[in-house]
Interface confidence: low
């Protein structure tokens, strides 16, 4: 009779993480008598996966009933596959011996490859805000995928970006991989509503890529433009001076009025109007009692935006243009409000 052969018909098996792997193995003869064992890896350090004779292997089930006398099918199923299960599996026939069974024949091995989906890409931007015309870096990370081949693309508002660098780690062989990419984005004043998108395509995603997004509203700072104007009021001895604060983002803003360098009033932007591009406008006004001043008045609107150094705009108020009540001691009117 021809000597027993151990047949592993599948050179390789590809299984998605979480699924069950079937590793096929048949013997060509019932002789010699002895059990089958499954191992992962070769050499002295092989890892026992299943022993027909003894042991507890909760993830392994046999395809056929190994207790039947004429059984020659030693295929197994391994449940809940993870990337860590990847490797070469060998079906090994043992010959009954005393005191121990002796290895008789090994199958040629089946390479188990595990397909694992990448995690949802996480996009993170710079720690500090930046102003338009500056270049900022965004990073995208995704982990736990296998095989190693993966495609990553960057978009800004649907337009593909080209200035980015991507690494897949580790370089060598591994049960699963991670991808890390850094993209450079030039900010514009219109970017408050913009989004940066990192898109990851992998064989496990069946053409439906994963996306991670970052809102540029968390990255951009648009500094305000200031305009100070003077409006006449019905009362002859009063002047209304307004400070228009335009096109700023984020909303955090504090405004201080100075009369001849002395603080007159400080207020925080609250009731703002939003522009279509996501920036804000705000207006503050100051009612000045001209009769309280003998000389010309320098009015300054000073704005501190989002913790940045203050910017200011000044307006010179000519007192000589109001001769009436010039000697009066009435105090300048300090109350004011911001208007929508």
């Amino acid at each position: 009779e021809e000597e027993l052969q151990v047949i592993q018909p599948d050179k390789s098996v590809l299984v998605a993480a979480g699924e069950t792997a079937t590793l096929r193995c048949t013997a060509t003869s019932l002789i010699p008598v002895g059990p089958i064992q499954w191992f992962r890896g070769a050499g002295p350090g092989r890892e026992l996966i299943y022993n027909q004779k003894e042991g507890h292997f909760p993830r392994v089930t046999t395809v056929s009933d190994l207790t039947k006398r004429n059984n020659m099918d030693f295929s197994i199923r391994i449940g809940n596959i993870t990337p860590a299960d990847a490797g070469t599996y060998y079906c090994v026939k043992f010959r009954k011996g005393s005191p121990d069974d002796v290895e008789f024949k090994s199958g040629a091995g089946t390479e188990l490859s595990v397909r694992a989906k990448p995690s949802a890409p996480v996009v993170s931007g710079p720690a500090a805000r930046a102003t338009p015309q500056h270049t900022v870096s965004f990073t995208c990370e995704s982990h736990g995928f296998s095989p190693r081949d993966i495609t990553l693309k960057w978009f800004k508002n649907g337009n593909e970006l080209s200035d980015f660098q991507t690494n897949v780690d580790p370089v060598g062989e591994s049960v699963s991989y991670s991808i890390h990419s850094t993209a450079k984005v030039v900010l514009t004043r219109e970017d408050v509503h913009s989004q940066v998108i990192c898109e990851v395509a992998h064989v496990t995603l069946q053409g439906d890529p994963l996306r991670g997004t970052a809102n540029l509203s968390e990255t951009i700072r648009v500094p305000p433009t200031l305009e100070v104007t003077q409006q006449p009021v019905r009362a002859e001895n009063q002047v209304n001076v307004t400070c228009q604060v335009r096109k700023f983002y984020p909303q955090r803003l504090q405004l201080t009025w100075l009369e001849n360098g002395n603080v007159s009033r400080t207020e925080t932007a609250s009731t703002v109007t939003e522009n279509k591009d996501g920036t804000y406008n705000w207006m503050s006004w100051l009612l000045v009692n001209v009769s309280a001043h003998r000389d010309d008045v320098k009015l300054t609107c000073q704005v501190e935006h989002d913790g940045q150094p203050a910017v200011s705009k000044s307006h010179d108020l000519k007192v000589s243009a109001h001769p009436k009540e010039q000697g009066s001691n009435t105090a300048a009117e300090n109350t004011g409000s911001n208007e929508r």
């Epitope: 191992f39 992962r40 890896g41 070769a42 050499g43 002295p44 350090g45 092989r46 890892e47 490797g87 070469t88 060998y90 090994v92 010959r95 011996g97 121990d100 069974d101 002796v102 290895e103 008789f104 024949k105 090994s106 040629a108 091995g109 390479e111 060598g172 062989e173 049960v175």
Partner: antibody, heavy 123, light 112 residues
């Protein structure tokens, strides 16, 4: 193509240290035990160390002549393994080969060898 | 350690002749799993050793059938039925059953 490639050899003074590297390609590196073997005219072929798989907690074994002086390690992410050699002696001079047990689970044997890297210990 | 003793040290042969190399281990080299991990290697000048025979008598893939191995316990033999020019070099036996693994001292096969 199944391949092992050693590097890191050279000239070192007695008592000195040296680290050899071996990069594997063309086979599933994590599945196999890795070995270092050296050769010199005086001592012939001499097996010196082996390192097991992750599933065997990277167990190591050494020849008596290098125990306590040499340390074998592996880095699966780089498909590489290493031999850190300390307190080198003249008798450690030779060609160092990395080699591995592969192919068949029941029939292990050193069937893949690198081309070797030469270590010379001399003052 | 298991000492592997090879004889002869040098073996002059004519092409087409049969050649036999002996290897004796200082102790039984049967592994605890029942297998005997006795291997034979050929090393040609300037090259690393190449595996010929594993587990006493199994020819490694690509090795011509003129090479055969035999033996058990502590005594092992490598035979080359008809020596060809490409067979010249140094032959080593090796035991992979007991740590530390050990090689024989080598047998140089050369032309008479």
């Amino acid at each position: 193509e199944v391949k092992l490639e050693e590097s890191g050899g050279g000239l070192v003074q007695p008592g000195g240290s040296m680290k050899l590297s071996c990069v594997a390609s063309g086979f599933t590196f994590r599945n196999y035990w890795m070995n270092w073997v050296r050769q010199s005219p005086e001592r012939g072929l001499e097996w010196i160390a082996e390192i097991s798989l992750k599933s065997n907690t990277y167990a190591t074994h050494y020849a008596e002549s290098v125990k306590g002086r040499f340390a074998i390690s592996r880095d699966g992410s780089k498909s590489s393994f290493y031999l850190q050699m300390n307190d080198l002696r003249a008798e450690d001079t030779g060609i160092y080969y990395c080699t591995t047990f592969t192919k068949v689970v029941a029939d292990w044997h050193l069937d893949v060898w690198g081309a070797g890297t030469t270590v010379t210990v001399s003052s | 350690d298991v000492l592997m003793t090879q004889t002869p040290l040098s073996l002059p042969v004519s092409l087409g002749d049969q050649a036999s190399i002996s290897c004796r281990s200082s102790q039984n080299i049967v592994h605890s799993n029942g297998n005997t991990y006795l291997e034979w290697y050929l090393q040609k000048p300037g090259q690393s050793p190449k595996l010929l025979i594993y587990k006493v008598s199994n020819r490694f893939s690509g090795v011509p059938d003129r090479f055969s191995g035999s033996g058990s316990g502590t005594d092992f033999t490598l035979r080359i039925s008809r020596v060809e020019a490409e067979d010249l070099g140094v032959y080593y036996c090796f035991q992979g059953s007991h740590v530390p693994f050990t090689f024989g001292s080598g047998t140089k096969l050369e032309i008479k």
